[in-house]
Amino acid sequence: TPEVWVQVQMEATELSSFTVHCGFLGPGSISLVTVSWGGPDGAGGTKLAVLHPELGTRQWAPARQARWETQSSISLALEDSGASSPFANTTFCCKFASFPEGSWESCGSLPPSSDPGLSAPPTPVPILRAD
């Protein structure tokens, strides 16, 4: 059964910058990745980026750059323009649509004790209930 992992890290150089990394572990070909914050896509979350392996990417503020890292993982850079960072306590969710297995989603947030530049290891996370 496919699994999705999510990790969020604060950039060491810029405390207002965060990066969300997401990956898909499983068979099938990925046809779409959707990244949202504040909850899952379609269940209270707000879309930040959509990545299609052939048609390209779309992103919405405060997303700065969405890109494929490998054939089965992506990264999304976020820029917080405000004085205080809202990202630290925010949940980020990644949904991978894979053919023919379907859609698989997981959510994550910055670990509470995170030092800038450090992040949780990219261990597989089972599909999480978000509601």
């Epitope: 059964t1 779409l32 379609g42 649509a97 023919p100 297995e101 379907g102 859609s103």
Partner: antibody, heavy 120, light 107 residues
Framework: EVQLQQSGPVLVKPGASVKMSCKAS????????MHWVKQSHGKSLEWIGI????????SYNQKFKDKATLTVDKSSSTAYMELNSLTSEDSAVYYC?????????????WGQGTSVTVSS | DIQMTQTTSSLSASLGDRVTISCRAS??????LNWYLQKPDGTIKLLIY???RLHSGVPSRFSGSGSGTDYSLTISNLEQEDIATYFC?????????FGGGTKLEII
């Protein structure tokens, strides 16, 4: 409004083939996978297979891999299913259903069904 | 293949009743459980996806719950238009499989 309009009922002879259609409207056809489901009279639902309209990739239930062929025509936003070597066991209502593209992997919109009767 | 079992094939209730329909999977399906209704004319509609999320346009009297292998659909205040057959479906693995259905009738 999402709609899936299926072709009308058919009566066919044993051994023949039949090709039914499912015309999609109200959404971008290539953005959502399409499922096909069989319902024999008074019985439950059986999943036949799924097709990705974007590239035509298919995946079938082993039970139906030699019975059904799924195709799409992107220009008309239409999905097709062809059933071959028909027998009385193939008499049923066949539904197309759009994949929700969401966790749970539900089928969020369904066609009205195409009734197939196999009789000599 | 994962077997989906709806032990109650038919259920009678009165308008206004709270009705619960159950579904069991032959293995853990991690909330990848969906509920549909089929009207007597054959029309099929999605009610609940991912165990408990309400599909758009579905009245709030419908709710879903469960985890692991056991799931349920609840109709909190039965209305005449709810008379239908209800199916569960797992979206956890291929092939997708459905329960046998529970036909809901009015007393």
């Amino acid at each position: 409004e999402v709609q899936l309009q299926q072709s009308g009922p058919v009566l066919v002879k044993p051994g023949a083939s039949v090709k039914m259609s499912c015309k999609a409207s109200g959404y971008i056809f290539t953005d959502y996978y399409m499922h096909w489901v069989k319902q024999s009279h008074g019985k439950s639902l059986e999943w036949i297979g799924i097709i990705n309209p974007y590239n035509g990739d298919t995946s079938y239930n082993q039970k139906f891999k030699d019975k059904a062929t799924l195709t799409v025509d992107k220009s008309s936003s239409t999905a097709y299913m062809e059933l071959n070597s028909l027998t009385s066991e193939d008499s049923a209502v066949y539904y197309c259903a759009r994949d929700s593209s969401n966790v749970g992997n539900a089928m969020d919109y369904w066609g009205q069904g195409t009734s197939v009767t196999v009789s000599s | 293949d994962i077997q989906m079992t709806q032990t109650t094939s038919s259920l009678s209730a009165s308008l206004g009743d709270r009705v619960t329909i159950s579904c069991r999977a032959s293995q853990d399906i991690s909330n990848y459980l969906n509920w549909y209704l089929q009207k007597p004319d054959g029309t099929i509609k999605l009610l609940i996806y991912y165990s408990s999320r309400l599909h758009s346009g579905v009245p709030s009297r419908f709710s879903g719950s469960g985890s692991g292998t056991d799931y349920s659909l609840t109709i909190s205040n039965l209305e005449q238009e709810d008379i239908a057959t209800y199916f569960c479906q797992q979206g956890y693995t291929l092939p997708r499989t459905f329960g046998g259905g529970t036909k809901l009738e009015i007393i």
